[in-house]
Amino acid sequence: AGVFELQIHSFGPGPGPGAPRSPCSARGPCRLFFRVCLKPGLSEEAAESPCALGAALSARGPVYTEQPEAPAPDLPLPNGLLQVPFRDAWPGTFSLIIETWREELGDQIGGPAWSLLARVTRRRRLAAGGPWARDIQRAGAWELRFSYRARCELPAVGTACTRLCRPRSAPSRCGPGLRPCAPLEDECEAPPVCRAGCSLEHGFCEQPGECRCLEGWTGPLCMVPASTSSCLGLRGPSSATTGCLVPGPGPCDGNPCANGGSCSETPGSFECTCPRGFYGLRCEVSGVTCADGPCFNGGLCVGGADPDSAYICHCPPGFQGSNCEKRVDRCSLQPCRNGGLCLDLGHALRCRCRAGFAGPRCEHNLDDCAGRACANGGTCVEGGGAHRCSCALGFGGRDCRERADPCAARPCAHGGRCYAHFSGLVCACAPGYMGSRCEFPVHPDGVSALPAAPPGLRPGDPQRYL
């Protein structure tokens, strides 16, 4: 067991042109905070994979208000270290993800708004107990300077925090087979770890995975009271006078509480008081909880079925991610039907419907012709969600309210002259052509019989609709 520690030294605009002046948006002042996530191994993990080695959130930093004329300084940062306790062995190789978050303090709907400003991901090798490692990383136009280290928490020592130490029983040397616990020369390596479940009160071991019983106890895990009080044949820490095993260590000897938990004895057992961020009988369960406020953008923190289980965030519509940190383009889901236009207003989704459709998602197909009278004898034709008028001759437009000039499109071919008529139009064809639109040439032996103009109309007369 141990703790990974991260110290942020500075976060600010990187060198070069185009560097941002301020982390805040135009909406007003903001402040920064950081999230660190540790994943085991050096393999490229999926972005959404859990922070299996642990995660931590910093406190919020001081409020930053941009001074337009002043040079952009290093930004005010939260105080203190970010600490990520780890329960098991330190893996040595790990992925370090540091996120810089911005909390906008302007007049936001629903309170402060959070957005991810920068994320750096590094794959690193690091031995526990070593010195601070320093690093500078760029994330877009931002630059982050930080140091980090992994340290073991007693009784664990070593580069992986797997060796256990405890105070020497004698001042001069360690017990048989146990080496001094460097660098703690006044401590010794602890006895090996017994078989899982071996009774803390009634069992002991000389080799890893063993479980040997003190007098009066039996069974594979030394949890069954023995009917005999004979000491013969038993070996182990013994009294020189009787040859029998003496009572073993108290339930708190060797501190069964992991991750810096403190042990207190209770009748026949023990109780661990765990540091913040750890839970469980032996403080073996680690992680951020709802008390740390991990859900952003109005997300609701929902604990697991019991206090030891991890939280989840239920995100408001429009946000997703394990901490509701990602804004969703809700219009990408195409919620508006029948060709409606989607508008994401932040606090709500709106659909602007095409003609002939209505409803919050344009799901209702209106009777296209209902209440849509076509003027001047036109008839309404439904289709495609928008009504259309089929107009009487001589009228046009959406509702047949516009007078139409049937000759405007020059329908008579080959120089024929067009005459508007109550029933449409008539073409007076040039010599040598015939047909309703003068489209056919007259055969050489044929004669054009069309009149120069229809009765009652002269070329050039204003249109008259009878």
Epitope: Q108, G111, A291, G293, L300, H314, G346
Partner: antibody, heavy 118, light 108 residues
Framework: QVQLQESGPGLVKPSETLSLTCTVS????????WSWIRQPPGKGLEWIGY???????NYNPSLKSRVTISVDTSKNQFSLKLSSVTAADTAVYYC????????????WGQGTLVTVSS | EIVLTQSPGTLSLSPGERVTLSCRAS???????LAWYQQRPGQAPRLLIY???SRATGIPDRFSGSGSGTDFTLTISRLEPEDFAVYYC?????????FGGGTKLEIK
């Protein structure tokens, strides 16, 4: 503007299941979380649980073993079922929409009184 | 769960007066995820304030909210006759969602 209307029997016998429906108008049920809250006569408000259109639910632990909230997007309705009722479940039951900027309640139905009595 | 305690339970005041209602949480309410509601007799509650200090749509500016952490207040700068009702606070930081016991504002 979203409007909500509770419906269901006003009298339920002890040990039976209370069933209420909330009909949503003026908005799509697919846009919000939807919740039930109750208020015993002369007392304060108690959150029962909520449902999202996708089916995600979350219930008050004090009622979890007896509560089911479900949603019917085709009818723009969501419903509450509370089993094994006793006189202590007598209350005005409200349906409400949860805001899009956080889990508070921006629109409420007018409430319906459910009495548990034999 | 977060327990919200409202005080006082009942308050007798006259129209025109200024009033401050208190809501105290048993644990820190992160991100100021706290709302206030007004409930008039025989009516459903109505949202007044969310995010501890943001007024809901259509709420008069005589209503204001403040506070953070575990202590929150609702202030009505000048009481109108229609303001005499019961006021509830609600946290939405973590599940289960919880309400305060309410403060009843009655006419003196």
């Amino acid at each position: 503007q979203v409007q909500l209307q509770e419906s269901g029997p006003g009298l339920v016998k002890p040990s039976e299941t209370l069933s209420l429906t909330c009909t949503v108008s003026g908005g799509s049920i697919s846009s919000y979380y939807w919740s039930w809250i109750r208020q015993p006569p002369g007392k304060g408000l108690e959150w029962i649980g909520y449902v999202y259109y996708s089916g995600t639910t979350n219930y008050n632990p004090s009622l979890k073993s007896r509560v089911t909230i479900s949603v019917d997007t085709s009818k723009n309705q969501f419903s509450l079922k509370l089993s094994s009722v006793t006189a202590a479940d007598t209350a005005v039951y409200y349906c409400a929409s949860i805001a899009v900027t956080g889990f508070y309640f921006d629109y409420w139905g007018q409430g319906t009184l459910v009495t548990v009595s034999s | 769960e977060i327990v919200l305690t409202q005080s006082p339970g009942t308050l007798s005041l006259s129209p025109g007066e200024r009033v401050t209602l208190s809501c105290r949480a048993s644990q820190r309410v992160n991100n100021n995820y706290l709302a206030w509601y007004q409930q008039r007799p025989g009516q459903a509650p109505r949202l007044l304030i969310y995010g501890a200090s943001s007024r809901a749509t259509g709420i008069p500016d005589r209503f204001s909210g403040s506070g953070s952490g575990t202590d929150f207040t609702l202030t009505i700068s000048r009481l109108e006759p229609e303001d005499f009702a019961v006021y509830y606070c609600q946290q939405y930081d973590r599940s289960p969602l919880t309400f305060g016991g309410g403060t009843k504002l009655e006419i003196k």
